[in-house]
């Protein structure tokens, strides 16, 4: 706090508000009888800029010229120093530095809509830090002038509140903006325009779309516009796309036919308007219209695959699988799939509509030649049926692909490779790579995956429905006419040592040897494809190394004989399982003593 100037005065020239870069004169003078006692020449007047001494003088007054002040406020304080006493504040001054307005740039005016009012914007340029008054002037034909003022530090927009009319669309109007503050003034360059230059139409409204006869090929977009609109731009895109299709139309009179829309697709439509071919500006885009195009009958054909399973001497189970059509092929909501099963020689056929599934299982006689046809139906019709003759896919041994391998390829991918069959490789029409999670029980409910590969390919990357640490049974089929050959392999995308060993559930004695039976390791603990089981045994209470027997893993196997045990010796037995990544921990331990005679 600086006391009111009781002991002296500070005067400032030319003003307390100065132009950046200019000089200010600060004079500090003592009032009569306010100096140091006894000797006035002992008066020492000191001028501080904030807390820093910048000048001093012995006597009744001090005069200081100050330059180089920054934008904003600088505080000066004048103090009196007498011998043997503290400095006494005399008076203070705040100097504010600002800048004169720069010339306003890029003055532009628009009238929003035919009934709107003229409003102008400009760029102020550098911040003046000062109250700056902007005056916008508009002059028109017949010496008409309008003026509007705005008294704000940050003013860069003014609305005249007047409406230009299209009576004389070529008449010239001139706008100019002048900025004035206490440090100077500046005017923009004039901006000259006509009604057509500055009227920006309102965006179109009331947008609608009609599909004649519910057909996507007969589509008309309708909208409403202001009266003088000559040009329109239409843009539209599927709702899930970022790219717009753009169409320019002249004298559309509020309607336009669209010919390239896709069926059963939600589109977003927007329209913009303009009054003149090369004058003025486009309106803002209208609000979006979102509409779904009608369905059309499906195109394309279903990808169908099947699996056969022997039931008994007279019956077999056929499981059919198919993949959904792509959105562009389905061209609507698929209501059902039609499956037709036909015995080719007897001509018997049965047809079934399947909803909510992409698979179908039936039981048929093992005799006869059977074929199936599967098609997809929406509200407008059906796709062309995919026909398949049911055959023994693995019957032709000479068509079996050779040297099938399955290797991990990054996260959740498996690269399957093979060699063409020995039989004339050119006979192969296509390969099918099929994979499903390996379940020891051979569960037919496990989802089946497949992909088709061209006859010249000898590898396929499978990634659909592949999970880490799961073993997949992979088959490669080579198809040629009504024949097929297949080879299979187990594969995983990622593996580690199994989390547990097999659980021995029984040990039985048979003619001097033993048969060990075990429970399979739960699938979620196998951690990939099992390669081997190991059976370990050692004499109870012995510190010797255990003996072991390694058995190649087979899905269905869960018992194994051992005939190298000594009679009447108690042994401890346990099992482990191995993947390519390593060995599991021990399963449970069982003791057994062979009762039979020694060899």
């Amino acid at each position: 706090k600086i006391d009111a100037c009781k002991r002296g005065d500070v005067t400032v020239k030319p003003s307390h508000v100065i132009l950046l870069g200019s000089t200010v004169n600060i004079t500090c003078s003592l009032k009569p009888r306010q100096g140091c006692f006894h000797y006035s020449r002992r008066n020492k007047l000191i001028l501080y800029k904030f807390d820093r001494r910048i000048n001093f003088h012995h006597g009744h007054s001090l005069n200081s010229q100050v330059t180089g002040l920054p934008l904003g406020t600088t505080l000066f304080v004048c103090k009196l120093a007498c011998i043997n006493s503290d400095e006494i504040q005399i008076c203070g001054a705040e100097i504010f530095v600002g800048v004169a307005p720069e010339q306003p740039q890029n003055l532009s005016c628009i009238q929003k809509g035919e009934q709107g009012t003229v409003a102008c914007t400009w760029e102020r340029g550098r911040d003046t830090h000062l109250y700056t008054e902007y005056t916008l002037q508009l002059s028109g034909p017949k010496n008409l002038t309008w003026q509007k003022q705005c008294k704000d530090i940050y003013c860069d927009y003014l609305d005249f509140g007047i409406n230009l009319t299209p009576e004389s669309p070529e008449s010239n109007f001139t706008a100019k903006v002048t900025a004035v503050n206490s440090l100077g003034s500046s005017s923009s360059l004039p901006s000259t325009f006509t009604f057509l230059d500055i009227v920006r139409p309102l965006p179109p409204w009331d947008i609608r779309i009609k599909f004649q006869k519910a057909s996507v090929s007969r589509c008309t977009l309708y909208w409403r516009d202001e009266g003088l609109v000559l040009l329109n731009r239409l843009r539209y895109r599927p709702s899930n796309s970022r790219l717009w299709n753009m169409v320019n139309v002249t004298k559309a009179k509020g309607r336009h036919d669209l010919l390239d829309l896709k069926p059963f697709t939600e589109y977003e439509f927007q329209i913009s308007s303009k009054l003149h071919l090369y004058k003025g500006s486009w309106s803002d885009w209208s609000e979006s219209l979102r509409a779904q195009t009608p369905e059309e009958e499906p195109t394309g054909m279903l990808d169908v695959w099947y699996m056969k399973r022997h039931i008994d001497y007279s019956r077999q189970q056929i499981s059919l699988f198919w993949k959904n059509l792509s959105v562009s092929e389905a061209r609507g909501k698929i209501l059902h799939y039609q499956v037709t099963l036909q015995e080719l020689t007897g001509g018997k056929a049965m047809t079934q509509n399947i909803t909510g599934h992409t698979s179908w299982t039936t039981v048929i006689p093992r005799t006869g030649n059977w074929a199936v046809a599967v098609s997809a139906a929406n509200s407008k019709g059906s796709s062309l049926p995919t026909r398949i003759n049911i055959m023994n896919l693995c019957e032709a041994g000479l068509l079996a692909p050779r040297q099938v391998s399955a290797n991990s390829e990054g996260m959740d991918n498996i690269l399957v490779t093979w060699q063409p069959p020995r039989k004339d490789p050119s006979a192969v029409q296509e390969y099918v790579v099929e994979w499903r999670e390996l379940h020891p029980g051979g569960d037919t409910q496990v989802p089946l995956n497949w992909l088709r590969s061209r006859p010249y390919n000898v590898s396929a990357l499978i990634s659909e429905n592949i999970k880490s640490y799961i073993c997949y049974e992979i088959r490669v089929y080579a198809l040629s006419g009504d024949q097929g050959g297949c080879s299979s392999i187990l594969g995983n995308s990622k593996h580690k040592a199994p989390l547990s060993g097999p659980h021995i559930n029984a040990i039985t004695e048979e003619k001097g040897s033993i048969l060990i039976s075990w429970n399979s390791i739960p699938v979620q603990e196998q951690m990939g494809c099992l390669l081997h089981y190991r059976i370990y045994w050692k004499e109870r209470d012995s510190n010797s190394q255990p003996q072991l027997c390694e058995i190649p893993y087979r899905v269905s196997q869960n018992s194994h004989p051992i005939n190298s045990l000594q009679p009447r010796v108690t042994y401890v037995l346990w099992m482990t399982a191995l993947t390519a990544a390593g060995e599991s921990s021990h399963g449970n331990e069982r003791e057994f003593c062979l009762q039979g005679k020694a060899n």
Partner: nanobody, 119 residues
Framework: QVQLQESGGGLVQAGGSLVLSCAAS????????MSWYRQAPGKQRELVAE???????TYADSVEGRFTISRDNAKDIVDLQMNSLKPEDTAVYYC?????????????WGRGTQVTVSS
């Protein structure tokens, strides 16, 4: 923004005195500077005197020694004591207040009070 109300104008003979007063109201923002400007018919508006909140002053050369500006910060009132008036002092006198507005100054003006000095 602050509202300014001027008073004290009138008709006075040359050599006489007048005191103009200006009261600020309606804004909590700190008033940095209070000033008196004048505008004679057909001329530009010009600075007469100004006083900062710390009491420092500035005077136009034409009024130095004759006019004194003073300010009561507590009441946001500024007075202009005008002595030895001359006919060329005839003008509309306007009060102006500059307030801090962030790091900028915002100005407010009064409506003005007429001072006429007859010879």
């Amino acid at each position: 923004q602050v509202q300014l109300q001027e008073s004290g104008g009138g008709l006075v003979q040359a050599g006489g005195s007048l005191v103009l007063s200006c009261a600020a109201s309606g804004s909590a923002a700190l008033i940095f500077l209070m000033s008196w400007y004048r505008q004679a018919p057909g001329k530009q508006r010009e600075l007469v005197a100004e006083v900062s909140r710390y009491g420092s002053t500035t005077y136009a050369d034409s009024v130095e020694g004759r006019f004194t500006i003073s300010r009561d910060n507590a009441k946001d009132i500024v007075d202009l004591q005008m002595n030895s008036l001359k006919p060329e002092d005839t003008a509309v006198y306007y009060c102006k207040a500059d307030q801090y507005y962030g790091d900028s100054l915002r100005s407010s003006w009064g409506r003005g009070t007429q001072v006429t000095v007859s010879s």
